[in-house]
Interface confidence: low
Amino acid sequence: DPASKSRSCGEVRQIYGAKGFSLSDVPQAEISGEHLRICPQGYTCCTSEMEENLANRSHAELETALRDSSRVLQAMLATQLRSFDDHFQHLLNDSERTLQATFPGAFGELYTQNARAFRDLYSELRLYYRGANLHLEETLAEFWARLLERLFKQLHPQLLLPDDYLDCLGKQAEALRPFGEAPRELRLRATRAFVAARSFVQGLGVASDVVRKVAQVPLGPECSRAVMKLVYCAHCLGVPGARPCPDYCRNVLKGCLANQADLDAEWRNLLDSMVLITDKFWGTSGVESVIGSVHTWLAEAINALQDNRDTLTAKVIQGCGNPKVNPQGPGPEEKRRRGKLAPRERPPSGTLEKLVSEAKAQLRDVQDFWISLPGTLCSEKMALSTASDDRCWNGMARGRYLPEVMGDGLANQINNPEVEVDITKPDMTIRQQIMQLKIMTNRLRSAYNGNDVDFQDASDDGSGSGSGDGCLDDLCSRKVSRKSSSSRTPLTHALPGLSEQEGQKTS
């Protein structure tokens, strides 16, 4: 009617100006809306340029809202990762510090002349924990073999022990058990404990990385149109007070975030597996008990070697022949006193229990993150209507929103009335991230059974192809190994999704 034609555009002018756009674009009064491409073509306060500007702005605002939600989740995962990582590193560092403080007094030159070998072992354990593709059992076996050769020579300075004799000693070693049960016990417990610790921390890293990558997936043009209609068309059509109907908003965002919702199943699987593997943090083969007590197994081993020295020597001579006497060498070293052992069972500090309890609660809270995202964004960012159903903005006018709310995920958007979604073209970035979640879940399931997935013949369907973006600040500063070995490259997802350490570059 003629009165409506002269309606003022004051409210639109205010909103448009507040967005930082030029007020010269805004008509003084409503104009005919045939030029509108997105909003319904009634009388309007928006020119073509205004419609385009507001469409771009609504698109940017949704992407920002999406990134904000993702950032909160990422921050939580990164905090968890750092807390657990700090704790696990602290356990291992404490063990090494105890070794460095007690072994010189307990074992004298048996330790000091081999200090670098012990340092190497801790380096390798750190490297393994960090996600390097090395075989822990082989690493431990190499350590014991190298240590046996060196200690045997030290215990028998009066003998000439050429390399071929030491090779023979090495071959006899398995049957003779020179270090007692310590190597076997350490191998069984350490493998399980380190696999559990590293896969849990990797899981947090992968989850964070997935969130970061998915947050960067651009929203398509169809989504932009639908969001513009949802957020700003009411202003253009002279009903600026009308807020979007809740179900209308949900349909728009379910259409816009259809691909993201497809992460739901694998995301839940990953989080479930992470919660499950925390069971492996307790008990005699648990993370806290084992990682913090590596030095006690090493002390037991050296004690066993000293206790067995005479028997061992006799059996080695029996198997390898009589070695030549070293005319320059001193007499056989006197039997040392046994190194005093700290109790192997570390009393739990309570720190890990607290960390696990918090992590479980937080992981449960974010289990439905991807499918609840449309609802969350609508209620938190879109200023939904709380008025009765027939007083909200339904995309055409103020009134009731009749269509049903769509299901979650891409396949369910086939009849979405608000966003035209091509369900035959899933987003490739999101498909890749679904695969990353699957791979990490398989790792965690293997780890739960005590297996290191990287060294099973029947491995999963490929290693992660995503980029691990560097490492935790204090992780990059951990030296990974005193030995260089080209085969020991970090896994793709060793510790992904974290900022590069202050310009440190490894080439």
Epitope: E96, R97, Q100, S123, D474, R482
Partner: antibody, heavy 124, light 105 residues
Framework: AVTLDESGGGLQTPGRALSLVCKAS????????MLWVRQAPGKGLEWVGV????????NYGAAVKGRATISRDNGQNTVRLQLNNLRAEDTATYYC?????????????????WGLGTEVIVST | ALTQPSSVSANPGETVKITCSGG????YGWYQQKSPGSALVTVI????KRPTDIPSRFSGSTSGSTGTLTITGVQAEDEAVYFC???????????FGAGTTLTVL
């Protein structure tokens, strides 16, 4: 950028003690092991010692063992070398160096950054 | 001490290899010094890692107990003394080589 600034050098008397300080910036100091290396005039490099990232562990070269103490203050981003009972053969340029790593186990092969050095002359 | 050649020379653009042996920890670092007593610059640490500001023509490798610094396409500004650093488990000490003087002809 990583910078390491040594101070405390100069002319020293034999038998006295020397205290060198290295002020670090441009990186998270408490995460990295720190080392001291020296170079006598016209000679090669000699490892003096290392201190772990937390400051709880140290290790020293044979020439200074028993006379040297390395300490650090992670709050102030400083590492200190104290060398007692100075000898003429301690005359050298002393360099503060940062390890690329941060657990006790760093050696000279791990140094990724150096200070400019401070010259110490031990003479009567 | 670690053993390295006392000098090497090359024309600009050529590839230079400097070796270092005698370390027992299989770990080497390489340090550049343009004049005695002047600043030291790490060109390679931990066998093969290059600090961010070092050109990619510098690379490091280890084979057995020998470390090698390779400069691919040597330039005039690379003329300096190069020290290698490593570890000797027999003395339980970190050690350096005596230095190799690189002359760019």
């Amino acid at each position: 950028a990583v910078t390491l600034d040594e101070s405390g050098g100069g002319l020293q008397t034999p038998g006295r003690a020397l205290s060198l300080v290295c002020k670090a910036s441009g990186f998270t100091f408490s995460n990295y092991d720190m080392l001291w290396v020296r170079q006598a005039p016209g000679k090669g490099l000699e490892w003096v010692g290392v201190i772990s990232s937390s400051g709880s562990s140290t290790n020293y070269g044979a020439a200074v063992k028993g006379r040297a103490t390395i300490s650090r203050d992670n709050g102030q981003n400083t590492v200190r070398l104290q060398l007692n009972n100075l000898r003429a053969e301690d005359t050298a340029t002393y360099y503060c160096a940062k390890s690329a790593y941060g657990y006790y186990g760093s050696g000279v092969s791990d140094i990724d950054a150096w200070g400019l050095g401070t010259e110490v002359i031990v003479s009567t | 001490a670690l053993t390295q050649p006392s000098s090497v020379s090359a024309n600009p653009g050529e590839t230079v290899k400097i070796t270092c042996s005698g370390g027992s920890g299989n770990n080497y670092g390489w340090y550049q010094q343009k004049s005695p007593g002047s600043a030291l610059v790490t060109v390679i640490y931990d066998n093969n890692k290059r600090p961010t500001d070092i050109p990619s023509r510098f690379s490091g490798s280890t084979s057995g107990s020998t470390g090698t610094l390779t400069i691919t396409g040597v330039q005039a500004e690379d003329e300096a003394v190069y020290f290698c650093g490593g570890y000797d488990s027999s003395t339980y000490a970190d050690i350096f080589g005596a230095g190799t003087t690189l002359t760019v002809l």
